[in-house]
């Protein structure tokens, strides 16, 4: 058997995506709902744990126990201002456990608290399972992507999430780097090119500038807005229609969570429509107090509602250009990543900013990061395909790295956006006369004072011979390898005495024991989830079949072909089953299957009678087989408000 493939996972804030490089090309893998991206959502209910589409679909019914945005928490401390700010907007509870944030939910009647790593591991498990269902064998090796601005703690926590999910994380790589790989595969051999990657996703916005030269990628600069994305555009539409509803019906729906959720779902759909059409309609039955809300919106109105947000995307572009010391004329290629880059106005603003330069839209924006991660996974697994064998990945240090000098000053040895692997050495000295040792405190960050940056670790170099201040020469070397692991060495040049620290950022990380416990819990949840998956599958099969049958016999084209008695028989039974389903969503698998078989017993003979002699089987998904045929349960896809 061929060697098991490694996968590439784009672990996104709102959506995740998985790809695999095999047979010389990347396949982006669809989930069980047929979607090539999967919501980064985990929901906990009285009976089950849901991940992905199923979790997002029921968020309106169960907001306090539906967790998303784990990526905004991962690797951060509870007291982090970002965490404190984001917490205000989440419907789920975040608690403090030793300055580590944990998400507290109610699950199967009990209060449970999960680390962000555990939530992310559940999403990663889902992505792993999606890949395994497609490949047909277990998958363990993976490359996972993170934003370029993620610090070491966030990267390490993401890696831990992978371990909890049962993955061997080959490497954590930057999202823009991954997108550049996806873009660069078919761009080798054209000399050095500067590429600007414009990544506007569901909840975040990142701009990166890279150079690509004959398969060698180098990140030059990164910038962005961690709270700008498709959801903000949805919000503008929601607010617009809340106001419209007020005007039309003199009622405020904004406090009704279910109504707002249903409106948001419709707005998201309308927004997508407006990327390809100049007008979109919304039709929401009984949105609020029995009132049907039928309305429409033009692309122009949408652009006006979001104009300031769209324009604001250009500020990080300018900042990245400044950081990379490039003029916009020096950018050869503009790459669009993230679903929101499909918005025509966003594309036009970017294109106009670059004086009409063509935008590269050859990569599906939702999939580019996973695509590149899949390629990188193949490289790391030793794939010899000519598409990838000449590719070399040069990543960057996302934040400046340095040490604290007198007065709490941050002295950077490795500047932000430096290509890694890299090694930098600098000479320091003592602050006091006869100082016997120095405390080397290693920080990452861009602030002038270390108190505003992130402490990675500290160590002492002692035994410095007595000398006046400023005389001893202490050589400090910062060395980052290709995996982003930092070694800091301090050497007293007069004695040759040295000490060092390896920063893998265990501080604030989960212990091996905690990770092991979480791995075991993940296994337990997986077994429960399997039972649940079968139950839901049986429910969906019943529901699909019932609605298919109902629409089949109501089809105008069948007038005169089906007796009124038979039609009534089918409709009555469908009504019975649909109503029973509404009242018994938590029924067991056996019950759903029993109801489906009962319904099939009534419907199949009638439906098959209609299509016999018509030169083919019944309509798709109806299961109008002859006796002893399959169950014909139809597609297992449903939409919940």
């Amino acid at each position: 058997m061929a060697k098991a493939a490694a996968i590439g996972i784009d672990l996104g804030t709102t959506y995740s995506c998985v790809g695999v490089f095999q047979h010389g090309k990347v396949e982006i893998i669809a989930n069980d709902q047929g979607n090539r991206t999967t919501p980064s959502y985990v929901a906990f209910t009285d009976t089950e744990r849901l991940i992905g589409d199923a979790a997002k679909n029921q968020v309106a019914l169960n907001p306090q126990n539906t967790v998303f945005d784990a990526k905004r928490l991962i690797g951060r401390k509870f007291g982090d201002p970002v965490v404190q700010s984001d917490m205000k907007h989440w419907p789920f509870q975040v608690i403090n456990d030793g300055d580590k944030p944990k998400v507290q939910v109610s699950y199967k009647g009990e209060t449970k608290a999960f680390y962000p790593e555990e939530i992310s591991s559940m999403v990663l498990t889902k992505m792993k399972e999606i890949a395994e269902a497609y490949l047909g064998y277990p998958v363990t090796n993976a490359v996972i992507t993170v934003p370029a601005y993620f610090n070491d703690s966030q990267r390490q926590a993401t890696k831990d999430a992978g371990v909890i999910a049962g993955l061997n994380v080959l490497r954590i790589i930057n999202e823009p780097t991954a997108a550049a790989i996806a873009y660069g595969l078919d761009r080798t051999g054209k000399g050095e090119r500067n590429v600007l990657i414009f990544d506007l996703g569901g909840g975040t916005f990142d701009v990166s500038i890279l150079t690509i030269d004959d398969g060698i990628f180098e990140v030059k600069a990164t910038a962005g807005d961690t709270h700008l994305g498709g959801e903000d555009f949805d919000n503008r539409l929601v607010n617009h229609f809340v106001e419209e509803f007020k005007r039309k019906h003199k009622k405020d729906i904004s406090q009704n969570k279910r109504a707002v959720r249903r409106l948001r779902t419709a707005c998201e759909r309308a927004k997508r429509t407006l990327s390809s059409s100049t007008q979109a309609s919304l039709e929401i039955d009984s949105l609020f107090e029995g009132i049907d809300f039928y309305t429409s919106i033009t692309r122009a109105r949408f652009e006006e509602l979001c104009s300031d947000l769209f324009r604001s995307t250009l500020e990080p572009v300018e900042k990245a250009l400044r950081d990379a010391k490039l003029d916009k004329a020096q950018i050869h290629d503009l790459v669009l990543v993230g679903g929101s880059t499909r918005i025509p106005k966003v594309q036009k603003l970017l294109q106009d900013f670059f004086n009409g330069r063509d935008l590269n839209k050859s990569i599906n924006p939702d999939e580019a990061v996973a695509y590149g991660a899949a390629v990188q996974a193949a490289i790391l697994m030793g794939d010899k395909s000519e598409n990838v064998q000449d590719l070399l990945l040069l990543d960057v240090a996302p934040l400046s790295l340095g040490l604290e000098t007198a007065g709490g000053v941050m002295t950077a040895l490795i500047k932000r956006n430096s290509t890694i692997p890299t090694k930098q050495t600098q000479i320091f000295t003592t602050y006091s006369d006869n100082q016997p040792g120095v405390l080397i405190q290693v920080y990452e960050g861009e602030r002038a004072m270390t108190k505003d940056n992130n402490l990675l670790g500290r160590f002492e170099l002692s035994g410095i011979p007595p000398a006046p201040r400023g005389v001893p020469q202490i050589e400090v070397t910062f060395d980052i390898d290709a995996n982003g692991i930092l070694n800091v060495t301090a050497t007293d040049k007069s004695t040759g005495k040295a000490n060092k620290i390896t920063i893998t950022n265990d501080k604030g990380r989960l212990s091996k024991e905690e990770i092991e416990r979480m791995v075991q819990e993940a296994e337990k949840y997986k077994a429960e989830d399997e039972v649940q998956r079968e139950r839901v599958s049986a429910k969906n099969a019943l529901e699909s079949y019932a609605f298919n049958m109902k629409s089949a016999v109501e089809d105008e084209g069948l007038k005169g072909k089906i007796s009124e008695a038979d039609k009534k028989k089918v409709l009555d039974k469908c009504q019975e089953v649909i109503s029973w389903l509404d009242a018994n969503t938590l029924a067991e698998k056996d019950e759903f299957e029993h109801k489906r078989k009962e319904l099939e017993q009534v419907c199949n003979p009638i439906i098959s009678g209609l299509y016999q002699g018509a030169g083919g089987p019944g309509p798709g998904g109806f299961g109008a087989q002859g006796p002893k045929g399959g169950s014909g349960s139809g597609p297992t896809i449903e939409e919940v408000d």
């Epitope: 009555d572 109503s579 029973w580 017993q601 003979p605």
Partner: antibody
Framework: QIQLVQSGSEVKKPGASVKVSCKAS????????MNWVRQAPGQGLEWMGW????????TYADDFKGRFTFTTDTSTSTAYMDLRSLRSDDTAVYFC?????????WGQGTLVTVSS | EIVLTQSPDSLSVSLGERATIKCKSS????????????LAWYQQKAGQSPKLLIY???TRESGVPDRFSGSGSGTDFTLTIDSLQTEDVAVYYC????????FGGGTKVEIK
């Protein structure tokens, strides 16, 4: 007229197998499900499960999963109930019953006696 | 699973008198969409196969005398034999078909 005719009484030893048949007539066999019901001596009725005669898919009640198998032969409009690894507590009358809105037609019953 | 509890276990009624049998379900058998309760009643005379009397709580099967009637909703159901006849001596079973199927334990009706 509609009739369900079951096979005759059986006496079996523990560990053996038995196959009870139920032949339908007077209606289109594949249009209605066929249920199986057990009645131990002096006891009430126990629903064992049923078979979708159109698709051949069986459903078993919890207490009847494992040793029981329901099948059909649509060419002869006959339903079968197979029971293997017989035990003494399997001694009972086994009924087949057609299902429309309820079990509207019943077979006469087949007595299966398990005795060493 | 749904449990059906019949009461009484046995009942002695004079000829021509009314017999009332109760059946209590562990959960509601009402389907709000069809507004039907999925409960049926069967009669089994000694040495015979069961016979369907009533389905959907109160719909009499064709050929069943009108002295037999069913009522109830949700979890509580009743079979009434208005004027007991000799041929009504039997065991009566309720059965639910709301989800899967289950029979009640049976009620034996005799002549006093």
């Amino acid at each position: 007229q509609i009739q369900l005719v079951q096979s005759g009484s059986e006496v079996k030893k523990p560990g053996a197998s038995v196959k009870v048949s139920c032949k339908a007539s007077g209606y289109t066999f594949t249009n209605y499900g066929m249920n199986w019901v057990r009645q131990a001596p002096g006891q009430g009725l126990e629903w064992m499960g049923w078979i979708n005669t159109y698709t051949g898919e069986p459903t078993y009640a919890d207490d009847f999963k494992g040793r029981f198998t329901f099948t059909t032969d649509t060419s002869t409009s006959t339903a079968y109930m197979d029971l293997r690894s017989l035990r003494s507590d399997d001694t009972a009358v086994y009924f087949c019953a057609r299902y429309d809105h309820a079990m509207d037609y019943w077979g006469q019953g087949t007595l299966v006696t398990v005795s060493s | 699973e749904i449990v059906l509890t019949q009461s009484p276990d046995s009942l002695s009624v004079s000829l021509g008198e009314r017999a009332t049998i109760k059946c209590k379900s562990s959960q509601s058998l009402l389907n709000s969409g069809t507004r039907k309760n999925y409960l049926a009643w069967y009669q089994q005379k000694a040495g015979q196969s069961p016979k369907l009397l009533i389905y959907w709580t109160s719909t009499r099967e064709s050929g069943v005398p009108d002295r037999f009637s069913g009522s109830g909703s949700g979890t509580d159901f009743t079979l009434t034999i208005d004027s007991l006849q000799t041929e009504d001596v039997a065991v009566y079973y309720c059965k639910q078909s709301y989800t899967l199927y289950t029979f009640g334990g049976g009620t034996k009706v005799e002549i006093k």
